[in-house]
Interface confidence: low
């Protein structure tokens, strides 16, 4: 129903704590360079205003839309043009154009320093002094680096962070309690970020229909006992929630997500037998739990899919009379039978089925034409299955770091024009798929691998869009989202690339590398590896292995030497010479 004051309505629904957290996330995602203090001040002003509207919905400006209220706040920030350049031009526009303008200026790769975690003692001190400010800093720092992070889920991660600190700061050895737990939350949050960015890309580039198809497939896999009407309702609601979050309407998004969780818990009987554990939890944990709940047991008596979609003589009539509904039921029926497939694969199969009906239903004998459609799915299914087997075998042989290096070589050869930092980031993320997915049971590997790779490649596309340099990447990123991963997999060495000339300074290292954390050391070595491939794109795996082994040996020797600086300055040039010779 319509409310006299939208801001009062959301404040009442969400409660002060969540309201403030979401407003802080919204401001941090829009204006990514502002300090925490600047945003905290705005949040307090907005919250105070919301309270006046709760007290009197007819008070001045309480009837204004949230976009108008928030936009006016952002546009009142001093020195907006000096700090944000052309983003300040958005403030000359009226709603809804102004909000659209803000959205277009969100930066997926802001030039902010990495989010460094303070050491345990310092963290615990500031957490104990002021938990609210501490968590506010966390929300602000994550949100500004990830401008499309799913806001209600970020509140969940902040809650996790809070619980870990409460527990570990009471321990004697704070460091060893905090580190593994916070690393776990960080890893999950980063995966959540790329997954949500993929959803927003789907919504932005291909509209609600594309996202809804994704949701139907995903929900049908998870809830195979729910009927199509139920799945359609859930998919519609989930699409609305994601549309709101991707559009910056974070209060509405969080409110509607809570409503959806409530609906699911009140209708478990018609949705799934696996929801009770989630439904017993408090709000943020409940919604998070529902989003990754295990698949329900598939009904035992499901008839063959062919009965309705191939053998039925009325297929073309059913298709013609209600295309979206008919294709929707196909996607539902196929997905509920295949929890072992990735959503991307299911959408490719639905697309193939649609194309087949478009072609066959215009022919003289449609059943003869579409009769083989299920057999034609086979190559589409085999391709990702082979990808999983090949890559998981390689991961098991090389381990995560070695697997990342193999991917780095592969992708640098496919798109050598892409900047080295982007290639290294992509390869490291793609390489984590091994640890994340290859250890899972066989039937869970394919959905895990392909849907994760698709999300990472979406980030590659977003970064490449800012500065397009590779025709290969442009080609793969221009197609539909579900075809991206197969497109990237099919790329071979870019024959148009003119190799980079060898620069000794690229491969010159100093003793400061010895004190870097292991992760930073790996990044330095992987940066060198990418540069080697850019210099010799057709170097064999054997040649590259020789050089990298030599390089690792050099680092090990010099970092153990009594006089590290001398070792690096004398042995370094020898290493460079040996590298050139090995690749000649």
């Amino acid at each position: 129903e319509a409310h006299k004051s939208e801001i009062a309505h959301r404040y009442n629904d969400l409660g002060e704590q969540h309201f403030k957290g979401l407003v802080l996330i919204a401001f941090s995602q829009y204006l990514q360079k502002c300090s925490y203090d600047e945003h905290a001040k705005l949040v307090q002003e907005v919250t105070d205003f919301a309270k006046t509207c709760v007290a009197d919905e007819s008070a001045a400006n309480c009837d204004k839309s949230l976009h108008t209220l928030f936009g006016d706040k952002l546009c009142a920030i001093p020195n907006l043009r000096e700090n944000y350049g052309e983003l300040a031009d958005c403030c000359t526009k009226q709603e809804p154009e102004r909000n659209e303008c803000f959205l277009q200026h969100k930066d997926d790769n802001p030039s902010l320093p990495p989010f460094e975690r303070p050491e345990a003692e310092a963290m615990c001190t500031s957490f104990k002094e002021n938990p609210t400010t501490f968590m506010g800093h966390y929300l602000h720092e994550v949100a500004r680096r990830h401008p499309y992070f799913y806001a209600p889920e970020l509140l969940y991660y902040a809650e996790q962070y809070n619980e870990i600190l409460t527990q570990c700061c009471a321990e004697a050895d704070k460091e060893s309690c905090l580190t593994p737990k916070l690393d776990g939350v960080k890893e999950k949050a980063l995966v959540s970020s790329v997954r949500q960015r993929m959803k927003c890309s789907s919504m932005q580039k291909f509209g609600e229909r594309a996202f809804k198809a994704w949701a139907v497939a995903r929900l049908s896999q998870t809830f195979p006992n729910a009927d199509f009407a139920e799945i359609t309702k859930l998919a519609t609601d989930l699409t609305k929630v994601n549309k709101e979050c991707c559009h910056g309407d974070l209060l509405e998004c969080a409110d509607d997500r809570a409503e959806l969780a409530k609906y699911m818990c009140e209708n478990q009987a018609t949705i799934s037998s696996k929801l009770q554990t989630c439904c017993d939890k408090p709000l943020l944990k409940k919604a998070h739990c529902l989003s990754e709940v295990e698949h329900d047991t598939m009904p035992a008596d499901l008839p063959a899919i062919a009965a309705d979609f191939v053998e039925d003589q009325e297929v073309c009539k059913n298709y013609a009379e209600a295309k979206d509904v008919f294709l929707g039921t196909f996607l539902y029926e196929y997905s509920r039978r295949h929890p072992d497939y990735s959503v991307s694969l299911l959408l490719r199969l639905a697309k193939k089925y649609e194309a087949t009906l478009e072609k066959c239903c215009a022919e003289a004998n449609p059943p003869a034409c579409y009769g083989t459609v299920l057999a034609e799915f086979q190559p589409l299914v085999e391709e990702p299955k082979n990808l999983v087997k090949t890559n998981c075998d390689l991961y098991e042989k090389l381990g995560e770091y070695g697997f990342q290096n193999a991917i780095l070589v592969r992708y640098t050869q496919k798109a050598p024009q892409v900047s080295t930092p982007t290639l290294v980031e992509a390869a490291r993320n793609l390489g984590r798929v091994g640890t994340k997915c290859c250890t899972l049971p066989e039937d869970q590997r394919l959905p895990c691998v392909e849907d994760y790779l698709s999300a990472i490649l979406n980030r590659v596309c977003l970064l490449h869009e800012k500065t397009p340099v590779s025709e290969h990447v442009t080609k793969c990123c221009s197609g539909s989202l579900v075809e991206r991963r197969p497109c990237f997999s099919a790329l071979t060495v870019d024959e148009t690339y003119v190799p980079k000339e060898f620069k000794a300074e690229t491969f010159t290292f100093h003793s400061d590398i010895c004190t870097l954390p292991e992760k930073e050391k790996q990044i330095k070595k992987q940066t060198a590896l990418a540069e080697l491939v850019k210099h010799k794109p057709k170097a064999t795996a054997e040649q590259l292995k020789t050089v990298m082994d030599d390089f690792a040996q050099f680092l090990d020797t010099c970092c153990k030497a009594a006089d590290k600086d001398t070792c690096f300055s004398t042995e370094g040039p020898n290493l460079v010479t040996r590298c050139k010779d090995a690749l000649a």
Epitope: N225, D227, D308, E314, K317
Partner: nanobody, 126 residues
Framework: EVQLLESGGGLVQPGGSLRLSCAAS????????VAWFRQAPGKEREFVAG????????YYADSVKGRFTISRDNSKNTLYLQMNSLRPEDTAVYYC???????????????????WGQGTLVTVSS
């Protein structure tokens, strides 16, 4: 389990009208794809009209399009078939059928419906 019970059949003159009802129990009628079929003496059972579950999209056999209207009343858990401009060739036993938990679209293939009513006879004659 879904139980279906048809009513409303009878004798009617050509050009006349009849309204058939099908009361469902055991499952909500809006959650399942439902359809009307008919069987004339000595002939195969044929699809007449259907309506999707959760999606109010209707389907009709070419022979009844424009004359028959399928609808449902969710509050009464009942399916209807409004038959106008009746012809002698519409004479048959009319059956109501349901297919829950399958695609929520109607199929025109009788074998795909697990639940059936006992039928109601419609005779069109002068």
């Amino acid at each position: 389990e879904v139980q279906l019970l048809e009513s409303g059949g009878g004798l009617v003159q050509p050009g006349g009208s009849l309204r058939l009802s099908c009361a469902a129990s055991g499952r909500y009628i809006d959650e399942t794809a439902v359809a009307w079929f008919r069987q004339a003496p000595g002939k195969e059972r044929e699809f007449v009209a259907g309506i999707g579950g959760g999606v109010d999209i209707t389907y009709y056999a070419d022979s009844v399009k424009g004359r028959f209207t399928i609808s449902r009343d969710n509050s009464k858990n009942t399916l209807y078939l409004q038959m106008n401009s009746l012809r002698p060739e519409d004479t048959a036993v009319y059956y109501c059928a349901a297919r829950p938990g399958r695609p929520q679209i109607t199929s025109k293939v009788a074998d795909l419906y697990p639940y059936w009513g006992q039928g109601t006879l419609v005779t069109v004659s002068s």
